[in-house]
Interface confidence: low
């Protein structure tokens, strides 16, 4: 069967299609090609006769058809109205006609598409995009591409029913997505430039940089301000409210406390109409002055007044420290802080408090101390002492008093005696004094600050020197047993007192020792040899005391009964006599020796060598006191033998007047008496 | 626009109490120290209280210590004062004012003042 | 606490005089002066602060001067709406003290 077959059934524009006659008959006459699905000579492009070698060009030949002897059909540079049906009738010799249809398509070559866009700056997450492919071309398949990727499901995307516009929704800001179309019919493929959509968006809230506050008066301050936005964001600055400047960045030299402030950075989006503000407060601080520390109280009474220390000067936007004794402040009852710590109260001060306080400033630029600040703290007067206290004086001395009170500030002193006022110094010197300067000193601290006023008062004697006393006697050799004695404390003292002292003991007063006359006067009844002492009397008043020198009494006494030793009564014939005489007495006595009634010698010792019998006898010792004008003897009976001595008896002692011996002892006396004398 | 609009005022008997409040508008408020000043009929200016900008540090006139108390709600951007055991001589025209920014010195805006009468 | 004193308590003058209000301070207050204006039945409004720095708005015929404890607010060319009643006040710590007012009048 005869069938027309097309090479290529889609032709390109201006490009050539053969269309090629396939099961022809043998024997042919000729074909004959015609426009259209049937035959219609008014549509003739032409014939061939093969026998003639004749091809003959029919009505509807343009010039660009070539018909083949192989019954082919060869257009060229074909146009869209070639497109259709070409109808190829054969011809047989036998005059039988075959008749067949092809067809081809002619499709214009497609030129490079582009995207529109109904808007081409949307709004992020707000306006839809429809893009759309041009040009609309007949019988054109079209695709789209996102970035170079065949179109994904999104329901952020959506397809026309034709293909064509593509539109996209939420569109987010920054969306860098790469959009491309691409058309296609049966001859070509074509793609468009890429295609990135202008999100508009914005602004964000605007930062504001840097953020370094605070800042120091005389810096300079300089803040950026950026908003996220597209298109670039415009920029207005506020201070306070009031418009600055329309710039991104805000510059201001040397700022003072003055620029502190609410600082608003307004950012504007010329395309989205909207605004967006951010605001910062900014603070400058001055550099603090060097802090000083005022008082309520300079001169605070000790335990008694509250001092409150007050850091200035006060300045905004300050912390206040304390320091005491370069120790930050620890927590005191006796301290306390205000609110804002700018004000210290010290309570109950002692006296001589050397603390040292100092009160810091710091802002956020700046730390500043004070210098330190001591208190004067005011006390006193306390009570005064009065010195030296080496009362009594001695009249002739020089009396010289210091008064001293411990008092803030010192004291001023004031001296009174026995009430009336004297001076008003811290000494009182007063030279040469006597009794009369006795009295009541009186010693008046006054403090000036506090007004309080302490006294102290001592008593101040003066008193005369006792002279040191002696004794007087009546009697400086009393007889024992016969004389009373009167020892006498001399000199007569007023307001004195005497004492007596006997053998350096205090006197005890007994029967035989009598007190008289304030006890000026001791009596001592019937003294006795053993009353010797020494005597010492003393004077005394409240000043001064006094002894005197000590004095013994010479007692006489005796003679006491004398003793003849040995007490031997017999001798041997040719032996020596030695015999000696002692009787206790005061002055010492005078001996004497009597032999058978014959004064012998005046000695305490009688010696007779070679003794005989005729030596035998009545030996007697008479002694002999001038001073009393007493004597006694004794007498011992001497037996000389031949042989060994016989027993003797004791000799015998006589004392006292009335007897022979007696008499001799008177004679002595006599005799001793004139001895004495010569 | 920088606006304070105290309210509150009125009469009063001594001994009584009253709130004054004070409305800011047109600036950052949280930013500003506040004060209370008065004025009695015919005088001078009297200073009563000032409160820091965030609150926390607050100072009173001798006249008025102990009686009345500054406090701020800065949410609210409202200044207010509490007035206790009035007297006679507390008599005036209250106004708040807003120190000058970052300043606890000189008063850079003021109410129009709100009329405090103390009698009996 | 720190007293303020103004002087003259009252002051007249004509358009275009230049004035002077002294105030004093009891102590040291360095420069930390403010002065206020303020007209009848109105709050008094901030013209000078730290002694010589002019609020916003403040017309610069208004200047200050002075530190330690003697200040001055100085109109250089007095115009109508000047006629005010003028106030010291120190803001150099608590309690704020102002002065008693200088009132300025037409002559």
């Known amino acids: 069967q005869l069938t027309i077959e097309s090479r290529p059934f889609n032709v390109a524009e201006g490009k050539e299609v053969l269309l090629l006659a396939h099961n022809v008959s043998q024997n042919l006459f000729g074909y004959i090609w015609y426009k259209g699905e049937r035959v219609d000579a008014s549509r003739r492009i032409g014939s061939c006769v093969i026998r003639t070698q004749q091809i003959t060009p029919g009505p509807a030949h343009s010039g660009r058809e070539t018909i083949d002897f192989n019954a082919s059909l060869l257009i060229q540079n074909v146009t869209q109205s070639d497109t259709g049906s070409y109808t190829i009738q054969v011809i047989k010799e036998d005059l039988v006609n075959e008749e067949a249809t092809g067809q081809f398509r002619v499709y214009p070559e497609l030129p490079k598409p582009y995207i529109t866009s109904n808007n081409s700056n949307p709004i992020e997450d707000k306006d839809a995009v429809a893009l759309t492919c041009e040009p609309e071309t007949q019988d054109t398949t079209y695709l789209w591409w996102v970035n170079n990727q065949s179109l994904p499901v999104s329901p952020r995307l959506e397809l026309s029913s034709d293909n064509r516009t593509l539109t996209v929704f939420n569109i987010p800001r920054n969306d860098t997505t790469s959009y491309k179309c691409e058309t296609q019919n049966p001859v070509s493929v074509r793609r468009s430039d890429p295609v990135t959509l202008n999100v508009l968006y914005g602004p964000d809230a605007p930062t504001i940089s840097p953020l370094n506050t605070p800042y120091r008066a005389g810096e300079y301050l300089n803040l950026t301000c950026h908003a996220a936005s597209n298109p670039t964001a415009q920029y207005f600055w506020f201070v306070n409210g009031t418009f600055q400047q329309s710039t991104q960045e805000l510059f201001i030299p040397n700022i003072t406390v003055n620029n502190s402030g609410s600082y608003m950075c307004q950012a504007h989006n010329s395309a989205t109409g909207l605004n967006r503000t951010t605001v910062t407060a900014i603070t400058v601080y001055a550099e603090l002055p060097k802090p000083y520390i005022t008082s309520n109280n300079s001169n605070p009474i000790e335990d008694k007044d509250a001092v409150t220390l007050t850091c200035e000067p006060e300045t905004q936007d300050t912390t206040y420290l304390w320091w005491v004794n370069n120790q930050r402040l620890s927590v005191s009852s006796r301290l306390e802080l205000s609110n804002d710590n700018r004000t210290l109260t010290v309570f109950n001060i002692p006296r001589n408090d050397t603390t040292f306080y100092e009160c810091e400033t710091q802002n956020p630029v700046s730390v500043r101390r004070s210098d330190p600040v001591t208190l004067n703290v005011l006390y006193g007067p306390d009570a005064p002492t009065i010195s030296p206290l080496n009362t009594p004086y001695r009249a002739g001395e020089n009396l010289n008093l210091s008064c001293h009170a411990a008092s803030n500030p010192a004291a001023q002193y004031f001296w009174f005696v026995n009430g009336t006022f004297q001076q008003s110094t811290q000494e009182l010197f007063i030279p040469n004094i006597t009794v009369n300067n006795s009295g009541s000193y009186m010693c008046q601290a006054h403090n000036s600050a506090t007004g309080l006023n302490r006294t102290t008062v001592t008593a101040i004697t003066v008193y005369v020197e006792l002279p040191k006393p002696y004794i007087s006697s009546n009697n400086s050799n009393p007889i024992e047993d016969k004389d009373a004695v009167t020892l006498t404390c001399e000199p007569v003292a007023e307001n004195t007192t005497y004492l007596w002292w006997v053998n350096n003991q205090s006197l005890s007063v007994s029967p035989r020792l009598q007190l008289s006359n304030g006890n000026r006067i001791l009596t001592l009844l019937s003294v006795t040899r053993n009353d010797t002492g020494p005597y010492e009397c003393g004077i005394q008043n409240s000043e001064s005391a006094k002894r005197s020198d000590p004095v013994t009494l010479n007692v006489t006494y005796g003679p006491d009964t004398p003793i003849i030793s040995p007490p031997d009564l017999s001798y041997r014939s040719g032996a020596n006599l030695n015999l000696s005489c002692h009787s206790d007495s005061n002055p010492s006595p005078q001996y004497s020796w009597l032999i058978n009634g014959t004064l012998r010698q005046h000695t305490q010792v009688l010696f007779i060598s070679k003794i005989t019998s005729n030596n035998n006898g009545a030996y007697a010792c008479f002694v002999s006191n001038l001073a009393t004008g007493r004597n006694n003897s004794i007498v011992k009976n001497i037996s000389v033998s031949s042989g060994d001595s016989a027993p003797g008896s004791s000799g015998l002692s006589a004392s006292g007047s009335g007897s022979g011996l007696n008499d001799i002892f008177e004679a002595q006396k006599i005799e001793w008496h004139h001895h004495h004398h010569h | 626009e920088v606006q304070l609009v105290e309210s509150g005022g009125g009469l009063v008997q001594p001994g009584g109490s009253l709130r004054l409040s004070c409305a800011a508008s047109?600036?950052?408020?949280?930013?500003?120290?506040m004060s209370w000043v008065r004025q009695a009929p015919g005088k001078g200016l009297e200073w009563v209280s000032y409160?820091?900008?965030?609150?926390?540090?607050?100072y009173y006139a001798d006249s008025v210590k102990g009686r009345f108390t500054i406090s701020r709600d800065n949410s609210k951007n409202t200044l207010y004062l509490q007035m206790n055991s009035l007297r006679a001589e507390d008599t005036a025209v209250y106004y708040c004012?807003?120190?000058?920014?970052?300043?606890?010195?000189?008063?850079?805006?003021w109410g129009q003042g709100t009329l405090v009468t103390v009698s009996s | 606490d720190i007293q303020m004193t103004q002087s003259p308590s009252s002051l007249s003058a004509s358009v275009g005089d230049r004035v002077t209000i002294t105030c004093r301070a009891s102590?040291?207050?360095?420069?930390?002066l403010a002065w206020y204006q303020q007209k009848p039945g109105k709050a008094p409004k901030l013209l000078i602060y730290?002694?010589?720095t002019l609020q916003s708005g403040v017309p610069s015929r208004f200047s200050g001067s002075g530190s330690g404890t003697d200040f001055t607010l100085t109109i250089s060319s007095l115009q109508p709406e000047d006629f005010a009643t003028y106030y010291c006040?120190?803001?150099?710590?608590?309690?704020?003290?102002f002065g008693q007012g200088t009132k300025l009048e037409i002559k």
């Open positions: 047109g600036f950052v408020f949280s930013s500003y120290d």
């Open positions: 730290n002694t010589r």
């Open positions: 004012a807003a120190h000058y920014f970052g300043s606890s010195g000189p008063f850079a805006y």
């Open positions: 006040q120190h803001h150099y710590g608590t309690p704020f003290t």
């Open positions: 102590e040291n207050i360095f420069a930390y």
């Open positions: 409160i820091s900008s965030y609150g926390g540090i607050t």
